[in-house]
């Protein structure tokens, strides 16, 4: 039995350019899209993803002393070089001389659970999203973003931290997942692949997208990141897939045009403030949501993931710039900085729209739709 397909509700249709580009058969995972040994699969494969800043990590005009016990950028594990069998490359961040932090890398030693035991947790991220198994949850209202349109001044810090490119956000960017679920944006960063190889962290029915943006938020119930780590709903990440489109994305160009300045691992530059919401899809009402973890050590759980149904379009040149400009330590490229998808282990992914109404060839047999856990909210 096949469920009727509703074109306008097709999961992950169309980029924020406004085109209707639902995942069609050509988007089904191919052999190349399936995890392979050289793709960063497996538990050890997290990128140095969430270089989560605490309040102290927001852009400072001058250095200031850190509060005792507060979580600093440097307090989180850093990434050491992965390798790709085809070419020397890496998505890596080497600790500064004298640092005694854990090192970790994609697809190699040490195993991530040894770096942080939480990486062996049962509710990890990223995951494969299967829209037909998602629970339609009408209680999931459109996301609300406030203060995301930043003026050009003050400038923002854009940094190659060795495992991603990260933009530190100033105070005042507020996001609500719903009533009483309020957050403050801290930073955003990207995940990408390499030439001809997609690099999103989340996948949709096994399909990996070219790249993915993460905007990391701290719950207003917590003053600092270290207090929120591991607490349910303490952190929230907005995630969107980046796809190839016909035109240059002017919002992304404001960041991508600056990557050459930070090609070297550990380097940073200042960029004019911009409209952060323009980096996200325009449709804030259609998304998938589940509880997971940071996708890098410390892999803390309790993170609320919101993955937009709509994708963002970048030109082929822009996607190439993203995947081919930055370097990790030594002579290794910063590429393929994504963690393999993790098992759901019984978790239900909720959808803010009826994503399961779909009769694609992927649903050849009857599917048991999950019910919305928050239906009574």
């Amino acid at each position: 039995q096949r469920l009727p397909r509703m074109q306008e509700d097709s999961p992950l249709g169309g980029g924020s350019s406004g085109e209707d580009d639902p995942l069609g058969e050509e988007d089904l995972p191919s052999e190349e899209d399936s995890p392979r040994e050289e793709d960063p699969p497996g538990e050890e494969d997290l990128p140095g993803e969430e270089d989560l800043p605490g309040e102290e990590d927001l852009p400072e005009v001058k250095p200031k002393s850190e509060e005792e016990g507060s979580l600093k950028l440097e307090d989180l594990p850093t990434v050491e070089a992965p390798g790709d069998p085809q070419e020397p490359q890496n998505n890596a961040h080497r600790d500064k001389e004298g640092d005694d932090q854990s090192h970790w890398r994609y697809g190699g030693d040490p195993p991530w659970p040894r770096v942080s035991p939480a990486c062996a947790g049962r509710f990890q991220s990223p995951v494969d999203i299967r829209p037909q198994l998602a629970a339609f949850c009408p209680a999931l209202r459109p996301l609300e973003l406030l203060g995301f349109q930043l003026p050009p001044l003050p400038e923002l810090r854009l940094r190659n931290n060795g495992h991603s490119v990260q933009l530190t956000l100033p105070p005042g960017l507020e996001m609500a997942l719903g009533p009483g679920r309020e957050y403050r944006a801290l930073q955003l960063h990207l995940h990408w692949g390499a030439a001809g190889r997609p690099g999103s962290e989340h996948t949709v029915e096994g399909h990996r997208f070219p790249a993915e943006i993460h905007v990391v938020h701290l719950s207003t119930a917590f003053a600092r990141v270290d207090e929120a780590l591991g607490r349910p709903g303490g952190l929230a990440v907005l995630a969107a897939f980046l796809e190839e489109g016909p035109e240059e994305n002017s919002a992304y160009e404001q960041l991508l045009s600056r990557l050459e300045e930070i090609a070297e691992e550990g380097s940073e530059t200042q960029v004019p403030g911009l409209d952060i919401s323009a980096l996200l899809p325009s449709d804030f009402s259609r998304y998938f949501q589940y509880e997971g973890s940071l996708t890098t050590p410390p892999c803390a759980q309790g993170v609320i993931w919101t993955v937009f149904n709509q994708t963002v379009m970048l030109s082929a040149k822009q996607l190439h710039t993203l995947s081919d400009t930055l370097w990790g330590p030594g002579d290794s490229r910063l590429q393929l900085n994504f963690r393999a998808t993790q098992p759901l282990n019984g978790r239900v992914i909720e959808a803010s729209f009826p994503a399961g109404v779909d009769s694609s060839p992927r649903a050849a047999e009857p599917v048991q739709l999950n019910s919305c856990l928050a239906a009574g909210d």
């Epitope: 005009v61 001058k62 349109q149 003026p151 050009p152 001044l153 003050p154 400038e155 002017s250 404001q254 530059t269 200042q270 960029v271 004019p272 911009l274 409209d275 323009a278």
Partner: antibody, heavy 124, light 107 residues
Framework: EVQLVESGGGLVQPGGSLRLSCAAS????????MHWVRQAPGKGLEWVAF??????????QYSASVKGRFTISRDDSKNSLYLQMNSLKIEDTAVYYC???????????????WGQGTTVTVSS | DIQMTQSPSSLSASVGDRVTINCHVS??????LSWYQQKPGEAPKLLIY???NLHTGVPSRFSGSGSGTGFTLTIRSLQPEDYATYYC?????????FGQGTKLEIK
């Protein structure tokens, strides 16, 4: 009175060098980003470079047309801005203006105080 | 780079006329646009910042409007001292770019 006074312009051969100076007065120089903007004879305005204030690390930014050839610098103790111009080309011929830009309290870069300009002529 | 296109390139008007100059921007710059006036042999002067804010000391006959990609400078009642060249400039991101200028001449 808020004032910017440029000096150092002149005639130079292609490939040569020149150093422009700008003396600022009447405002807290250290607070501001400072720019150089130029205007070729009979043409429009072209932004050349800026240098951030102390709070933002004094880091510079250049237009593509001068990057690698020109160097902007400042000396807050002397309330002075400089533009070192090397490998000069005929197309660098212009009036060069010292301009005050944004600062910590600004929302964006607008150029609210301009010097009178100094003329640079690159010719063989 | 963000491209700025002013129209018209030149115009003739009489004292007392209402004059409008347009500036089209190649991408959305919100309200981060300024207008400048330059007279021959002088440095430019800031008239309007943030699309519509009048700079200190600028006569109230000057006004600015617009946001996104389209902006307008209006001179309500032209005065003899207003004959000059006018430039728009984006302050969204560097390289900062100016329009090519609009020369306002006496009719």
């Amino acid at each position: 009175e808020v004032q910017l006074v440029e000096s150092g312009g002149g005639l130079v051969q292609p490939g040569g060098s020149l150093r422009l100076s700008c003396a600022a007065s009447g405002f807290t120089f250290t607070d501001y980003y400072m720019h150089w903007v130029r205007q070729a004879p009979g043409k429009g305005l072209e932004w050349v470079a800026f240098i951030r204030n102390k709070a933002s690390g004094y880091t510079p930014q250049y237009s593509a047309s001068v990057k690698g050839r020109f160097t902007i610098s400042r000396d807050d103790s002397k309330n002075s801005l400089y533009l070192q111009m090397n490998s000069l080309k005929i197309e660098d011929t212009a009036v060069y203006y010292c301009v005050r830009g944004g600062h910590a309290g600004s929302n964006y870069w607008y150029f609210d105080v301009w010097g009178q300009g100094t003329t640079v002529t690159v010719s063989s | 780079d963000i491209q700025m296109t002013q129209s018209p390139s030149s115009l003739s008007a009489s004292v007392g006329d209402r004059v409008t100059i347009n500036c089209h921007v190649s991408q959305n710059i919100n309200v981060w646009l300024s207008w400048y006036q330059q007279k021959p042999g002088e440095a430019p002067k800031l008239l309007i910042y943030q699309a519509s804010n009048l700079h200190t000391g600028v006569p109230s006959r000057f006004s600015g409007s617009g946001s996104g990609t389209g902006f307008t400078l209006t001179i309500r009642s032209l005065q003899p001292e207003d004959y000059a060249t006018y430039y728009c400039q984006q302050g969204q991101s560097y390289p900062f770019t100016f329009g090519q200028g609009t020369k306002l001449e006496i009719k």
